[in-house]
Interface confidence: low
Amino acid sequence: ETVHCDLQPVGPERGEVTYTTSQVSKGCVAQAPNAILEVHVLFLEFPTGPSQLELTLQASKQNGTWPREVLLVLSVNSSVFLHLQALGIPLHLAYNSSLVTFQEPPGVNTTELPSFPKTQILEWAAERGPITSAAELNDPQSILLRLGQAQGSLSFCMLEASQDMGRTLEWRPRTPALVRGCHLEGVAGHKEAHILRVLPGHSAGPRTVTVKVELSCAPGDLDAVLILQGPPYVSWLIDANHNMQIWTTGEYSFKIFPEKNIRGFKLPDTPQGLLGEARMLNASIVASFVELPLASIVSLHASSCGGRLQTSPAPIQTTPPKDTCSPELLMSLIQTKCADDAMTLVLKKELVAHLKCTITGLTFWDPSCEAEDRGDKFVLRSAYSSCGMQVSASMISNEAVVNILSSSSPQRKKVHCLNMDSLSFQLGLYLSPHFLQASNTIEPGQQSFVQVRVSPSVSEFLLQLDSCHLDLGPEGGTVELIQGRAAKGNCVSLLSPSPEGDPRFSFLLHFYTVPIPKTGTLSCTVALRPKTGSQDQEVHRTVFMRLNIISPDLSGCTSKG
């Protein structure tokens, strides 16, 4: 029986689906286990410039070989503002400096990429070392490149159409997936269906797709069913903010009980069949119907709540027209530098031109402090003692004021420098998760709780734990607790920060051998990062704490003996 339900695009205010996938239009993954240099090549196509891109490189330590040096070759077809995160990775970056602009200094070794066609770029990269991965991506918003992960069977990377990059590369397209909706004719009531169809990928290995469902309505107002259909090798991990009926292929589990797998059903693999399934489940509205390539994370935001469905005749433009100046983007390009008791703001003219902005003035809060025009950039500099600087115990603050031709009112942005001389970082060890009574003693087999604090507190900056390790001397060796802001092993847990935002974690220490060390040193590297704007004022500190270790316990978990 044909189901009458005329699928039409739904406006983004009613439903939006974003996703992360490892499927690429062209790509390859190869293994180069003994290479000193791990080479990755990205060909990025953007429909219009300038675009913003978040690129994260993540290292996975395998057999003690990481990190090798990494060469990342970035080939783009138009202007890109790049936010690069590659913490602790010995990275060399080859790119076209006239097209790629960093939102903050990359802090890595860079090389100018010759203007070659694709095949020659691959050859140029291969001369520097065996290519581990290469991929062609169309209009990415963010890319995650996992290093040391190559599972490819190939020993030589050759671009092939429609490839699955596995764990090596995941990316999020800028354009959300097309969300369609319709009324199921002849069904009464307000029950709504959200249907997500994941199309088969190019690698048939077992996959878990995380589905985040956020429905903005009160729980009592909702009667909904979530239908997830995908290839047989796909299982689902559901993270939903509402209770709803779940109907899936394969197996599924909930984020709150990830180990509890629930068997799904055999579902039809055609749009018509899935609409029929929704009807059978008494849904009167298909609030969202989405077809996606094989994804790792899918986020559905919807606000229908069983109400009247609205469809939109055409996609709504979400990016500003190419020829208008975006003040927000412009303000994000102001770089703040803090040195020699002075604050310096830099705004590169080339970037301003990319944004089609005409600047008529750049000053601090005190308008008499004007920027110098230094040919290729505007530079605004002031000592901490003038230009309306506000000096507090922890920070020096001011405001960047930019006048642009296309706007009658000036654009303002808070700018800050840290007063490093007055900041102190402390590590605290506690024996309970209430973090009340500090201690300097850990007991094997008992959980220990750690908190890092900066004083005085700095509200505009975020205190983050980059890494922590416990040095147990020659007998105990080093126990890595946190690396790359992630917990190492199952005996370490990152906890919610304190109400003041102080990072916290817990760890459990066991020993397999004797003698058990009597003392150890807990060492953590912390970073203060601006909550907004550029990362040029990022500050790193290593904090130490001497610990005593009591009472033997020979069962368990972490340390090498």
């Epitope: 000193i36 003690g64 070989t65 990481w66 990190p67 090798r68 040096e69 010995p90 400096s97 960093f102 200094p105 990359p106 802090g107 890595v108 070794n109 860079t110 090389t111 100018e112 390790h469 040095d471 080093t478 790193h540």
Partner: antibody
Framework: EVKLEESGGGLVQPGGSMKLSCAAS????????MDWVRQSPEKGLEWVAE??????????YYAESVKGRFTISRDDSKSSVYLQMNSLRAEDTGIYYC?????????WGQGTTLTVSS | QIVLSQSPAILSASPGEKVTMTCRAS?????MHWYQQKPGSSPKPWIY???NLASGVPVRFSGSGSGTSYSLTISRVEAEDAATYYC?????????FGAGTKLELK
């Protein structure tokens, strides 16, 4: 042939200042990350400071022991790198080498000697 | 910071002998570089990224290691090898050098 030539060393009193220079030739200086490394009998080889290339925004990095006292700078048009040293202490005494970092210190100058003594 | 401990501090060898010197790091590092220095001269790059010989270094030299333990080996020592050898890491800030192993010929 890559050549690095340091100058500017000498005798200075504690608390005084001194500026070292390093003239480079034989390679594309503007692309290079340049460092100062010092050597003393007491402390051995010790990294002091680094200034990166234009492509890396001429970012500067310092050893904790010299932070706030030493300033590294460069002039790409003159293929030169400098080390301005203020508030000098006796423990800053040593031979100062200008080096180029390319995955390791692949080129070293002959060194210039700084003596801090009253 | 990562402390590099070189041993032995002084190594005495006869020409033709095989010698090995070690460099231990206080924490795991991704690779090690080695430099050779002769009295009155500046250090010279000798081995980079653990096992790669710098330009002009004789093939009797080799480097190996991983994690916290690295070594430099000379298969058959020659008179011209008498020098001090320093290891260096930059897997973790700050960049650090070892105190050196002085190779003397008997």
């Amino acid at each position: 042939e890559v050549k690095l030539e340091e100058s500017g060393g000498g005798l200075v009193q504690p608390g005084g200042s001194m500026k070292l220079s390093c003239a480079a030739s034989g390679f594309t200086f503007s692309d290079a990350w340049m460092d100062w490394v010092r050597q003393s009998p007491e402390k051995g080889l010790e990294w002091v400071a680094e200034i990166r290339s234009k492509a890396s925004n001429h970012a500067t990095y310092y050893a904790e022991s010299v932070k706030g006292r030493f300033t590294i700078s460069r002039d790409d048009s003159k293929s030169s790198v400098y080390l301005q040293m203020n508030s000098l202490r006796a423990e800053d005494t040593g031979i100062y080498y200008c080096t180029r970092w390319r995955r390791f210190f692949d080129s070293w100058g002959q060194g210039t000697t700084l003596t801090v003594s009253s | 910071q990562i402390v590099l401990s070189q041993s032995p501090a002084i190594l005495s060898a006869s020409p033709g002998e095989k010698v090995t010197m070690t460099c231990r790091a206080s924490s795991s590092v991704s690779y090690m570089h080695w430099y050779q220095q002769k009295p009155g001269s500046s250090p010279k790059p000798w081995i980079y990224a653990t096992s790669n010989l710098a330009s002009g270094v004789p093939v009797r030299f080799s480097g190996s290691g991983s994690g916290t333990s690295y070594s430099l080996t000379i298969s058959r020592v020659e008179a011209e090898d008498a020098a001090t050898y320093y290891c260096q890491q930059w897997s973790s800030n700050p960049l650090t050098f070892g105190a050196g192993t002085k190779l003397e010929l008997k």
